[in-house]
């Protein structure tokens, strides 16, 4: 290859030789690599102003490898594009893009929305949540005994968190007010409390029962209606009326 | 110096093979990479393949299924056969070298050979 | 396949004149490209290869620059033997591809 340095030759090709370093098959002084040995990637390396050629095992990042017969080279990757596979096939993109079936998009397609910590176009999540649990007992203070109108909650459990355009969880618990048939509390249930429930039994009688828990997106309410309202008041009376008697006191009564 | 020379008929009838040899003086063709151009009466260059200092091929896509380029290194030569020509391929067929991505491509050219195919 | 979109197809210049000869990709081709002359009954002659590199021997008034999709063959003080064809080639892909040609004429 060498043995011919006619005119035309210098005039045509810069000096090219086969004695050459680091994996290249031809070089030249001025060029470093022109081809490089089997299996062997040829890339122009940048040094300050000017390009040499290099052969090199692997491409370098922003390139991917391209074999044909006896000649492999790196090539670009597409300009908006840090890391491909192959020309078509990009698996990271550069700053302010998103990956897609391999492409870089500046803005995700309809129905992908954009994660900004991978940077790649994914499927929008809704929320799932699980059926509701059965309603618990019926309790007022943590105890099932001891009192008329307590309240039962149910749960349920979310089953898969939504993404950032996904629709949001409903709520996961929801709380009622129920009514119980009165029972006495036994005498492991009762304890202190039991006791000093005896004590203050009239006053508690008394006192206004309420219950609530409505979850902040707007379930069931628990407040009462005025007819519940009413019908408590006349049931209160009535239970006054039958302390009276029992005292053999009169009293006057009068109906709201 | 570096001198490559095409010979081969220059009157192909339609449907038969084209049958081009390129031989190489000054440079061995155990080294580099030999290929085929061609240049269409309106100008257009078209590259058609190489065969590598191996021995290997590669070939346009367009024409892969009818070229077939081979080499006989004894002889310093190298050869182009195009099947099933149409008049279409009418034009100048060039021989032509290139030692790799680093160097200058196609550095060196034979001065052609016009082919015309007609019946 | 890599099209090389060439401009202009043809053109007038005057002696001493700068001309210049554009040659567009259809993707980055990261500077694999070369420039040649061809004169009528010749075969064609590497002026410019890697995008700015001179084949020794080739006056220096030729001169080529570009990057990416875009590249040029300036040529800076135009003589009567500039007169022919200029074509660009890509080689970062195979298959390697021209452009269609500038015919260069004197005024």
């Known amino acids: 290859q060498n043995a011919s340095r006619g005119r035309r030759q210098r005039r045509m090709h810069p000096n090219v030789s086969q004695g050459c370093q680091g994996g290249c098959a031809t070089c030249s002084d001025y060029n470093g690599c022109l081809s490089c040995k089997p299996r062997l990637f040829f890339v122009l390396e940048r040094i300050g102003m000017k390009q040499i050629g290099v052969c090199l095992s692997s491409c370098p990042s922003g390139y991917y490898g391209t074999r044909y017969p006896d000649i492999n080279k790196c090539t670009k990757c597409k300009v908006d594009c840090d890391t491909c596979f192959n020309k078509n096939f990009c698996t990271k993109c550069k700053s302010g893009f998103y990956l897609h079936l391999g492409k870089c998009l500046d803005s995700c397609p309809e129905g992908l929305e954009a994660n900004n910590h991978t940077m790649e176009c994914v499927s929008i999540v809704h929320c799932e949540a699980s059926e509701w649990s059965p309603w618990s007992p019926c309790m007022k203070k943590g105890k099932t005994c001891g009192f008329k109108r307590g309240t039962e909650t149910r749960v349920r459990d979310i089953l898969q968190h939504p993404s950032a355009k996904g629709n949001l969880c409903p709520p996961t618990s929801e709380t009622r007010t129920c009514i119980v048939q009165r029972k006495k509390c036994s005498k492991g249930e009762r304890g202190k409390k039991g006791r000093e429930r005896k004590r203050k039994k009239l006053n508690k009688e008394e006192r206004k029962e309420t219950s609530s828990s409505s979850d902040s997106k707007g379930l069931e309410s628990s407040i009462e209606t005025p007819d519940q309202q009413e019908n408590k008041e006349r049931q209160q009376q009535q239970k006054r009326r039958a302390r009276d008697k029992q005292q053999k006191s009169v009293s006057v009564s009068t109906v709201h | 110096e570096v001198q490559l020379q095409e010979s081969g008929p220059s009157l192909v009838k339609p449907s038969q093979t084209l049958s081009l040899t390129c031989s190489v003086t000054?440079?061995?063709?155990?080294?580099?990479?030999w290929s085929w151009i061609r240049k269409f009466p309106g100008n257009k260059l078209e590259f058609m393949g190489y065969?590598?200092?191996?021995?290997?091929?590669y070939y346009i896509p367009s024409l892969k299924s009818r070229v077939s380029i081979t080499r006989d290194t004894s002889k310093n030569q190298y050869y182009l056969q195009l099947n099933s020509v149409t008049t279409e391929d009418t034009a100048t067929y060039y021989c032509?070298?290139?030692?790799?991505?680093?160097?200058?491509?196609?550095?060196?050219w034979g001065q052609g050979t016009l082919v015309t195919v007609s019946s | 396949d890599i099209k090389m979109t060439q401009s202009p197809s043809s053109m007038y210049a005057s002696l001493g004149e700068r001309v210049t000869i554009t040659c567009k990709a259809s993707?980055?081709?990261?500077?694999?490209l070369s420039w040649f002359q061809q004169k009528p009954g010749k075969s064609p002659k590497t002026l410019i290869y890697?995008?700015?590199r001179l084949i020794d021997g080739v006056p220096s008034r030729f001169s080529g620059s570009g990057s990416g999709q875009d590249y040029s063959l300036t040529i800076n003080s135009l003589e009567y033997e500039d007169m022919g064809i200029y074509y660009c080639?890509?080689?970062?892909?195979?298959?390697?591809?021209f452009g269609a040609g500038t015919r260069l004429e004197i005024k």
């Open positions: 032509a070298t290139y030692h790799g991505y680093g160097g200058p491509w196609f550095a060196y």
């Open positions: 000054g440079d061995s063709i155990t080294s580099g990479y």
């Open positions: 065969i590598s200092f191996s021995g290997k091929t």
């Open positions: 993707q980055d081709i990261d500077s694999y």
């Open positions: 890697l995008t700015n």
């Open positions: 080639l890509q080689y970062d892909e195979f298959p390697v591809t």
